[in-house]
């Protein structure tokens, strides 16, 4: 699944949490809450697709309650009365317990899966496209809530236009209730058209024989550092790469580095002894030339925390720090299929990584 | 190329442990949910546990609540399912199965398409 | 536990002949439905996912389709190489979450 025209994630949100949906709800898209159940306070947490922040009209009110054995409600609220309650009487969450959260929207039905099984399906009893906000409550924490469209990348390499004019940049770190839309790349005064050459193929025997290669997301926070992990598929245009971590107290530099083979592709590595953010290109051990310039103040803090959203496009990776967009840098490896390896080390607790 | 390679099967006497390994290359375990699928001699399929791992979530079939445990390791990309207090019915061979669940196309999409090539377990005095 | 009930158990058929396995679900499972074609001492291997969709590298002459709660898995044209034992699987979210069809074994008339 292609990020192209995606909304970027809502980080570590504060929970009562209700958030915008850009062009609301679309048939195909699939929205994903990842978190933890509380294990101390409160019996229940609520996801709710609604119409506007006031709570009155809520399409779907997906509604875990560790109550009596533990079952899930969902439910549709017009105009401030409820309807009919729809219970599901298996609970796939556990208290203490992380989560992953999934939710389809399809023209007859929301579908939800929870850690990777399909759970409950439920038919509209409203139109969808009057959602415009999903909110969260209850006893919960919330690591991210992240946003998939549903374009993907076609099958056989091809020459197609993509707009790259929606945002594609993290939002704003979250202050309060209500989480205001996520930036945009800076763009040229009009709106971006690319054409992107698609190269990607899946392997011999892939289950899905589409390059569009599903986000894959790692568990917190068992991250062992130096932490390697594959990028399925490699990098193609519309590729997004998703990190958050905290810089040790007493950090002197760490990297990420996109590999390819014994090439690193793109080495990313900030320094603090330095006050730098360095970029680089290794080639067969030789390093190219440097990158260093900045539009602004180092990004990176010791003891903060940071996100770093890598956004591949045909020419270039863009790199925005904490939702601002910081620098492009233009390929030197230009195979991006061959790009599969993510390497991150160094001074840094890395808190979430999405490939 | 992805794989999964099951072992630590063999011959163990009833109310005896075993721990079974899947060692999966070409994936992350931490980004699909692995399960366990038995087929005991001249029988069908018997969905035994799953783990997804990038949560830590867990299920078993009922016949093996409480005997068995299924657990991830993810820096070494490997599964495991111990298996206690083990009966005669457990006989089988074991395979563990990468299943799939994502979105392509405006749908979901859902089956196990990689599977190790098995291991067997034999419960017998 | 949501039940998938497979039939029949065996038939036996000739090469070319057009043959259809059936499941039914105990209640909805949605299209989390695959199917599965299994050779003696071999590990299953997925043939359709998602109730109708073609796995990789499947031949098209193996087809899926979803009725309300039952599903079939059709082969067209049957070759020498489909002679084998074949399962329905649901994902549906239950006290067990997976759950397989008994098997349909394809015999040589």
């Known amino acids: 699944m292609a990020f192209s025209g995606s909304q970027a994630p809502y980080l570590s949100p504060a929970v009562p949490f209700s958030g915008t949906i850009q062009g609301g709800l679309q048939d195909g898209l699939q929205i994903t809450v990842n978190g933890t159940v509380l294990s101390s306070s409160g019996t229940r947490f609520a996801v709710n697709f609604q119409t506007g922040f006031s709570g009155n009209d809520i399409a779907f009110h997906f509604n875990p309650r560790f109550e009596d054995g533990g079952y899930v409600v969902c439910n549709t609220r017009q105009n401030g009365s409820w309807g009919p309650e729809e219970r599901k009487t298996h609970m796939p969450f556990q208290k203490g317990m992380p989560f992953d959260l999934c939710f389809l929207v399809q023209s007859s039905d929301f579908k939800v899966m929870v850690n990777g099984i399909l759970f409950v399906q439920y038919f509209h009893r409203v139109p969808f496209h009057r959602v415009d906000t999903i909110s969260v409550n209850g006893s919960v924490q919330l690591s991210y809530i992240s946003f998939q469209n549903p374009r993907t990348v076609p099958v056989q390499p091809a020459f197609s236009t993509v707009p790259f004019s929606q945002p594609v940049c993290f939002p704003p770190r979250p202050r309060g209730r209500r989480q205001k839309p996520p930036g945009v790349w800076p763009a040229n005064p009009a709106p971006i058209t690319q054409t992107v050459i698609h190269t990607v193929q899946s392997a011999p025997g892939q289950m899905f024989s589409t390059p569009a290669i599903p986000p894959m997301m790692y568990p917190h926070p068992a991250y062992p550092m130096p932490f390697i992990t594959t990028i399925l598929g490699g990098l193609y245009p519309s590729k997004s790469i998703l990190l958050s971590g905290t810089v040790l107290p007493s950090a002197q530099r760490f990297h990420i580095n996109l590999c390819s083979g014994n090439h690193i592709a793109f080495h990313l590595n900030p320094r603090f002894d330095e006050n730098a953010v360095v970029r680089n290109t290794q080639i067969d051990n030789s390093w190219g030339s440097e990158e260093r310039s900045l539009p602004r103040k180092m990004p990176f803090v010791r003891g903060q925390s940071f996100s770093v959203w890598i956004l591949c496009e045909a020419h270039c990776l863009k790199v925005a720090v904490d939702g601002q967009h910081l620098f492009e840098y233009y390929h030197r490896l230009r195979n991006l299929p061959t790009i599969n390896r993510l390497e991150v080390g160094g001074d840094i607790q890395l808190t979430h990584v999405q490939t | 190329e992805v794989q999964l390679v099951e072992s630590g099967g063999g011959l163990v006497q009833p109310g005896g442990s075993l721990r079974l390994s899947c060692a999966a290359s070409g994936f992350t375990v931490s980004s699909s949910s692995i399960h366990w699928v038995r087929q005991a001699p001249g029988k069908g399929l018997e969905w035994v546990a799953y783990?997804?791992?990038?949560?830590?979530?867990?299920s078993y079939a009922d016949s093996v609540k409480g005997r068995f445990t299924i657990s991830a390791d993810t820096s070494k990309n490997t599964a495991y399912l111990q298996m206690n207090s083990l009966r005669a019915e457990d006989t089988a061979v074991y395979y563990c199965?990468?299943?799939?669940?994502?979105?392509?196309?405006?749908?979901?999409?859902?089956?196990?398409?990689?599977w190790g090539q098995g291991t067997l377990v034999t419960v017998s005095s | 536990d949501i039940q998938m009930t497979q039939s029949p158990s065996s038939l036996s058929a000739s090469v070319g002949d057009r043959v259809t396995i059936t499941c039914r679900a105990s209640q909805s499972v949605s299209s989390a439905v695959a199917w599965y074609q299994q050779k003696p001492g071999k590990a299953p291997k997925l043939l359709i996912y998602?109730?109708?969709s073609l796995y990789s590298g499947v031949p098209s002459r193996f087809s899926g389709s979803r009725s309300g709660t039952d599903f079939t898995l059709t082969i067209s044209s049957l070759q020498p190489e489909d002679f084998a034992t074949y399962y329905c699987?649901?994902?549906?979210?239950?006290?067990?979450?997976?759950?397989f069809g008994q098997g349909t074994k394809v015999e040589i008339k």
């Open positions: 783990i997804y791992p990038y949560s830590g979530y867990t």
């Open positions: 199965a990468r299943y799939s669940t994502y979105s392509s196309s405006s749908k979901w999409v859902w089956g196990m398409d990689y």
């Open positions: 998602s109730a109708s």
């Open positions: 699987q649901q994902s549906y979210y239950d006290s067990n979450p997976i759950t």
